[in-house]
Amino acid sequence: SERCDDWGLDTMRQIQVFEDEPARIKCPLFEHFLKFNYSTAHSAGLTLIWYWTRQDRDLEEPINFRLPENRISKEKDVLWFRPTLLNDTGNYTCMLRNTTYCSKVAFPLEVVQKDSCFNSPMKLPVHKLYIEYGIQRITCPNVDGYFPSSVKPTITWYMGCYKIQNFNNVIPEGMNLSFLIALISNNGNYTCVVTYPENGRTFHLTRTLTVKVVGSPKNAVPPVIHSPNDHVVYEKEPGEELLIPCTVYFSFLMDSRNEVWWTIDGKKPDDITIDVTINESISHSRTEDETRTQILSIKKVTSEDLKRSYVCHARSAKGEVAKAAKVKQKVPAPRYTVELACGFGAT
């Protein structure tokens, strides 16, 4: 056959679906690779063809669209499973072609099993809620297009294994789950089960997401430098190792880039000739506030080094701060024998 633009296996779109549930999978060509949509392609006389390679096989084969109850069907640029089976796992290819044009892409589809508490190998999206912030909601994800707006599904929400059926703090409201106040105890996996009828059959869609309760913007502050501070003086003799920790607390801020850096005499350590190393460690609180520690180390400090200015800097979306470390050369204690000799008037 003639040449075809092959976009290869699109592993960025590792699609996971639950066994025995409906799945609708859009051909990725129109979403990520081509500059036109399916309608334009269709009206231009292009045809969309689907085929697949079973798991652990090399042979490409056509998809069987003649299964009982139309278990697998195609509608426009969507491949439908009503429902999926475990052995539907494999690499699926959609190819758009006519006599003069051809473009195709493959993508992996994994059909996943879940247990009665919705545990599975499925990768879960994470939804962050601000702690004690007022009403916040999560929405049952990826259910658009499964049933028409005239169909009213029933939606049941679970936290872990437990059905949420009261409204003391977390209120199930159809596709939404409303948190009157988000608390650390609300951290966990939330599952919505959407049940809807279609052609005399009942289908279930299961969607699980992880809720992570994080620091509230109401409580966010600019970075706080705990060290260096005015109470600690780094007093060293030449030849000793100089270790200065810069410890900075950052409030959680959505999508904020937290930065810590040292300057020595106003320059970045990379831009000066002294032999300095910097090691960084990061820790997080339960609400994802961050503490970063950068330890500046000079193995054998010189008297010149002890005269330099060492400043720790920190920056977040809330602001920038800096603090200088108090570094000084230790004055050597007078030697006992000399002192004694002077005391007796010896010359």
Partner: antibody, heavy 122, light 111 residues
Framework: QQLEQSGGGLVKPGGSLELCCKA??????????ICWVRQAPGKGLEWIGC?????????YYANWVNGRFTLSRDIDQSTGCLQLSSLTAADTAMYYC??????????????WGQGTLVTVSS | ALVMTQTPSPVSAAVGGTVTINCQAS??????LAWYQQKPGQPPKLLMY???TLASGVPSRFSDSGSGTEFTLTISGLQSDDAATYYC?????????????FGGGTEVVVK
């Protein structure tokens, strides 16, 4: 476990009053909301608002409250209070506090105070 | 705002009989409804919540059904101790507000 209410009584129109609700047998903590409901003589129940007993003390009020009533809580004293101000005769009612547990296993208002009567009259 | 409409009131039945109380919400409140029993001079007592969950210590003679905007409380095998006023409570959130709204109450008279 009980909610003991105090602070009701006779008050003149335009006046103020503070009603309180003390937890006994359990301590008010981040596990609870304290809510207030009132009932005019011979009438039905009317929700006033709720306050979260945890650190933020977040509050929700019924629209009709319009800033006249204020919820507060003192975790150390294990007490929730309702400050009533700009009172009118229409505020004459039995005022109840109720507990709501922050979990998925109990209903809203699983424990109620005995009620305290507020009478607004000149 | 959310409006809860309760019917009928009063309702009466003989001991051993069955009574049904209806509660209608002005908005779709899904299953966010509770039922309370109140006797004269006493605070309300939680009976059921979340549609179908009995509160602790409540006998199984009490049952409820419904979701969305139409709800029903049924008391079967009526006993003289069931004489009381029954209230539904609906909960609804909208943007940053939460509405807890009681129905007007239904008095149950046991003959």
């Amino acid at each position: 476990q009980q909610l003991e209410q105090s602070g009701g009584g006779l008050v003149k129109p335009g006046g103020s009053l503070e009603l309180c609700c003390k937890a006994s047998g359990f301590s008010l903590s981040s596990s609870y909301w304290i809510c207030w409901v009132r009932q005019a003589p011979g009438k039905g129940l009317e929700w006033i608002g709720c306050i979260y007993a945890g650190s933020s003390g977040s509050t929700y009020y019924a629209n009709w409250v319009n800033g006249r009533f204020t919820l507060s809580r003192d975790i150390d004293q294990s007490t929730g209070c309702l400050q009533l101000s700009s009172l009118t005769a229409a505020d004459t009612a039995m005022y109840y506090c109720a507990r709501s547990i922050v979990d998925f296993s109990s209903g809203w208002g699983d424990l109620w105070g005995q009620g305290t009567l507020v009478t607004v009259s000149s | 705002a959310l409006v809860m409409t309760q019917t009928p009131s009063p309702v009466s039945a003989a001991v051993g009989g069955t009574v049904t109380i209806n509660c209608q919400a002005s908005e779709d409140i899904y299953s966010n409804l509770a039922w309370y029993q109140q006797k004269p001079g006493q605070p309300p007592k939680l009976l059921m919540y979340g549609v179908s969950t009995l509160a602790s210590g409540v006998p199984s003679r009490f049952s409820d059904s419904g979701s969305g905007t139409e709800f029903t409380l049924t008391i079967s095998g009526l006993q003289s101790d069931d004489a009381a006023t029954y209230y539904c409570l609906g909960v609804y959130t909208y943007i940053s507000d939460v509405y807890y709204t009681f129905g007007g109450g239904t008095e149950v008279v046991v003959k």
